[in-house]
Interface confidence: low
């Protein structure tokens, strides 16, 4: 005799009893009414299962909650199924067997026929696990059922001191969907919240789980697929306050079926977004957007933000949204990079874009901007990176495209190519009134518009000029004069400089900022406009440094241990961290601080000039870094503002030194022999280069490096020209992640010391 191998299969679900109604007592597990009714309902459920062929496998069951409307019973039951039959008894098959029994004319005296009028249509059976039951049981001491009426905002209170875990069973009207809002109120927290697309905590129906405070998402809104949701709130150790506000409401289903016809222009024409954006998209999301282009000259570009698409094997589910575009199946995934999906138009002028959630696990709502591009020239003057659909500068010495194709097959890399014989000359020699090419092609078209390219400056009227770095050089190169606008910047207040020295003189670096918490210098920064200071995002990565309220910004400061008449201080009203900043890779290491009141410029306080995206800082050029950072690795911060000259380093050299961890948003400066470098406390401070006009331009922000001044390891700086679009967007009020926006962090807000 051989014992049959069985496996415990857990099912969870609900059924509606048409001849019973919900009462408040039934919503409280501790009430006598609940105990009595749940025992009877459990017996009824047991009889129902037993009367089908599942009866021989029955192990146990429980009715753990009741809900509104005709009385809804929420239950689980366990069947011990022979191993060989496990796959045949899916939730669908089990439901069918139970429904058939409910609809049968059998003359049974079982309570599901005599006492309870069970609605077969309303029977729900879901797959569950033993672990789901364990989680459910751990919350039953703090189980709260709430019916969410339309128009009502229901606050959910956290576990009290006695309980560590609570479960809300939320239910709303059948034609509405449950939406939970979670708003962080504290900087430090260890609580966990999990939301499920079911009445109970079924792992396979998890929508999202949150642990610790997220500065990236100070407010989260999460949608269920329908009118039921379970929320489990597990209190962290030593957590005495609710770290967030939790509330819930019932909302109408929002349609996302759109038909659009685009106009024949190349700028952004609008956006597509999932229902209730920026709420998490619902597990039942199915959007269908049909876009028509005006002619086959155009292709369609979809511009994503921190989200990208990639091909996925057909047998694999998309875990962050499925996209169907022109019969191509793509999976969405979160990324801290920009991405564009380009859709070529070949035979038809229309394209349907379908977005579907394939699993219950969802994520932040998706918003995608759309525009047209010229199919014959998708990136005028630039290179189309097929990996991410972006137009990137070509042959500028920086591999912007992940596969580096933008720097392949270059005749002249980061130089000007003479038309006569393809000789390469350095960019500063272009339009300098000195012919360098054989027939002087470097000095042609210097007073007229030229096709836009990697090193051409784009004027406000979108025309381009050939002369490199024409901004604020005292000569009007653009027809509209825009290259000489916003030029109240980059001039030193006092010109006496200690050449070769290390101590700065007053007014020498009038844009230098000292960012302090409680009187202690933490990071450097630079004044770029009358209410804006730029610095490094990593200065704010500790949870204890994340709030703008903590910071004081000093401008015109010389010495840390004393004040003098030329210095002024400001509080910070808002903090913007670059939304793509990644702590581990140091990528996009830039932040903007909005000061609480405007700066009055003086000889000791004035802004540095911001470079255009096309501004070329030539490798080998000598530039300057300033700050109060340590004067040796591991040493204390300096009292007096220090300055040091460093040489800009070619990207590939630096990339090799750091084993290819240097992104296009990074710039390297220093010396192979080391010695001169930024150090702890200099983070966020400016790397500035002087143009022939005498004006100083911000090339970089002190970001990271291996030690300080070590041979073969240069200082790594945030490359300002690669984040200038975001800077301008924030300065003109166009967003960027305000009031925070970084991941969970764990190293010091000073020059990274590895």
């Amino acid at each position: 005799y051989k014992a049959e191998v069985t496996v415990s299969q857990v099912y969870s679900g609900s059924l509606r009893v048409l001849n019973r109604h919900f009462s408040q007592d039934l919503g409280r597990r501790e009430s006598i009414a609940f105990r009595s009714e749940s025992a009877k309902a459990q017996k009824m459920l047991q009889e129902l299962v037993a009367s089908t062929r599942l009866g021989t496998y029955y192990n146990s069951s429980s009715v753990y909650s009741f809900g509104e409307g005709p009385l809804t019973c929420f239950f689980w039951f366990i069947l011990d199924i022979p191993e060989y039959q496990r796959l045949t008894l899916s939730p669908e098959v089990v439901r069918e067997l139970l429904v058939d029994e409910l609809l049968s004319n059998s003359s049974t005296l079982a309570s599901y026929k005599t006492e309870y009028e069970v609605d077969p249509e309303g029977l729900v059976i879901l797959e569950a696990s033993v672990n789901d039951i364990v989680v459910l049981n751990s919350t039953l001491g703090c189980y709260r059922y709430s019916y969410v009426n339309p128009g009502q905002v229901l606050p959910l209170k956290g576990p009290d001191q006695q309980t560590t875990s609570c479960l809300w069973h939320l239910q709303g009207p059948e034609d509405l969907m449950i939406k939970v809002r979670l708003e962080w109120t504290r900087v430090d927290c260890r609580d966990r919240v999990a939301m499920y697309d079911a009445a109970g905590p079924l792992e396979k129906r998890l929508i999202t789980s949150v642990y610790g405070c997220s500065r990236q998402e100070p407010v989260m809104e999460v949608l269920a697929s329908g009118s039921v949701m379970a929320v489990v709130w597990k209190k962290g150790m030593h957590s005495y306050y609710d770290p967030f506000l939790l509330s819930v409401k019932s909302v109408a289903f929002q349609d996302c079926q759109v038909n659009l016809t685009l106009e024949g222009r190349l700028d952004t024409q609008g956006f597509l977004r999932t229902p209730y954006y920026p709420s998490y998209y619902s597990p039942s999301t199915h959007c269908s957007w049909h876009l028509t282009v005006p002619s086959l000259d155009y292709g369609l570009a979809l511009w994503f933000d921190a989200y990208a698409l990639r091909r996925q094997k057909y047998n694999r589910l998309c875990t962050q949204g499925q996209w169907m575009i022109q019969n191509r199946r793509l999976c969405g995934f979160r990324t801290l990079q920009p991405y564009a999906e380009r859709i070529p138009m070949v035979a038809s002028d229309g394209v349907t874009i379908n977005f579907t959630s394939q699993i219950s696990l969802t994520g932040p709502g998706v918003q995608v901007y759309y525009s047209l591009y010229n199919q014959s020239d998708p990136c005028p003057g630039e290179f189309l990176c097929s990996v991410n659909g972006l137009c990137v500068p070509a042959c500028d010495g920086i591999k912007d495209c992940p596969n580096g194709l933008d720097e392949r097959n270059c005749v002249c890399r980061a130089m000007f190519q003479c038309q006569e014989d393809s000789t390469c000359i350095s960019l500063p020699r272009v339009c300098d009134r000195q012919p360098d090419c054989l027939n002087g092609s470097d000095e042609e078209q210097c007073q007229e518009g030229v096709p836009c390219g990697t090193f051409t400056f784009q004027c406000e009227d979108r025309s381009c000029v050939k002369k490199p770095n024409p901004e604020c050089d005292g000569q009007s190169d653009c027809r509209d004069g825009s290259d000489e606008q916003h030029c109240d910047c980059g001039l030193q207040g006092l010109s006496s400089r200690i050449v070769g020295g290390t101590v700065s003189s007053e007014g020498e670096w009038p844009w230098q900022a000292s960012l302090q918490i409680r009187g202690r210098h933490i990071c450097g920064g630079a004044l770029i406009a009358d209410r804006w200071v730029i610095t490094a995002a990593h200065c704010f990565q500790e949870d204890s440094m994340a709030s703008p309220k903590l910071w004081t910004v000093f401008l015109g400061k010389m010495r840390q241990n004393s004040r003098w008449p030329g210095e002024v201080s400001f509080k910070v009203s808002r903090l913007f961290l670059h939304p793509y900043h990644e702590e581990d890779s140091h990528d996009y290491d830039v932040a903007l601080l909005q000061l609480d009141h405007p700066v009055v410029y003086s000889a000791t306080v004035r802004p540095v000039c911001l470079p255009a995206r096309s501004h070329f800082f030539e490798p080998g050029q000598h530039c300057w870094i300033t700050g109060w950072g340590a004067q040796r690795e591991g040493g204390p911060v300096s009292n007096t503002l220090q300055k040091v000259d460093v040489q800009l380093v070619p990207q590939d050299l630096c990339s090799e030194a750091y084993r290819y961890q240097v992104s296009p948003r990074m710039l390297c400066a220093g010396y192979r022999k080391g010695k001169k470098d930024a150090c702890q406390g200099d983070s966020g401070g400016p790397l500035v280069c002087r143009e022939p006009s005498g004006r100083w331009f911000l090339a970089g922000l002190v970001s990271w490096g291996l030690g300080c001044g070590r041979p073969n390891f240069f200082g790594v700086y945030t490359r300002v020209t690669r984040v200038i679009n975001w800077i301008q967007q924030v300065l003109t009020g166009g967003g960027g992640s305000g009031g925070g926006g970084s991941h969970h962090h764990h190293h010091h807000g000073s020059h990274h010391h590895h």
Partner: antibody, heavy 124, light 111 residues
């Protein structure tokens, strides 16, 4: 079963043309960069050409540039190599190979599935 | 693009280790981390053993390991077995979407 089968080889006179085909099965063809690699009998391997999934990036070895053309038909799960102006030194066993399976947008420059090869003999 | 340099032959007794070298330039092996190693038995198609310098495809025994230093990549076969007797080829990405192979090393298992 993942499989690549080359065909179209044979004996050909120098200066003439030949078209090699490679039939793919058992995997999603349009998710892979594809390669042609050749091997002169008793000698080493030589990369000839590669083509990305959308045919948007194509590359050739200097030794065949201007004479050979790689193409693919994703609908037919087929890879081709059109060889013109053949020379005696093109005599070799020609393999079709696919890029290593993995993340779709990532390049490995490694070939994890190879065909058995088709022999091309160019007589002068 | 010129071929990578591999020694024509190498040998070892069963159970021993053998290390094969593959020398390129700063434009291929030295610049990119896309070095692969292939094994080829006579009359058979090559088989991928290592990719991205040191990663093993599934199914390849952990006796095979890869590394790189400057412009030279290495393949070490430890615990040599009779079936390891074959030709071994290295390859590297060489920029501009081009791949370059080595001339191959014939590995003989003695005894």
């Amino acid at each position: 079963e993942v499989q690549l089968v080359e065909s179209g080889g044979g004996l050909i006179q120098a200066g003439r043309s030949l078209r090699l085909s490679c039939a793919a099965s058992g995997f999603t063809f349009d998710e892979h960069v594809m390669y042609w690699v050749r091997q002169i009998p008793g000698k080493g391997l030589e990369w000839i050409s590669s083509i990305t999934w959308k045919s948007d990036i194509i590359a050739y070895a200097d030794s065949v540039k201007g004479r050979f053309t790689i193409s693919r038909d994703n609908a037919k799960n087929a890879l081709y190599l059109q060889m013109n102006s053949l020379r005696a030194e093109d005599t070799a066993l020609y393999y079709c190979a696919r890029e290593k399976d993995g993340d779709f947008y990532y390049y490995y420059f490694a070939m994890d599935v190879w065909g058995q090869g088709t022999t091309v003999t160019v007589s002068s | 693009q010129s071929a990578l340099t591999q020694p024509p032959s190498a040998s070892g007794s069963p159970g021993q280790s053998v290390t094969l070298s593959c020398t390129g330039t700063s434009s291929d092996v030295g610049y990119y981390n896309y070095v692969s190693w292939y094994l080829q038995h006579p009359g058979k198609a090559p088989k991928l053993m290592i990719y991205e310098v040191s990663k093993r495809p599934s199914g390849v025994p952990d006796r095979f390991s890869g590394s790189k230093s400057a412009n030279t990549a290495s393949l070490t076969v430890s615990g040599l077995q009779a079936e390891d007797e074959a030709d071994y080829y290295c390859s590297s990405y060489a920029g501009s979407n081009k791949v370059v192979f080595g001339g191959g090393t014939k590995v003989t298992v003695l005894g």
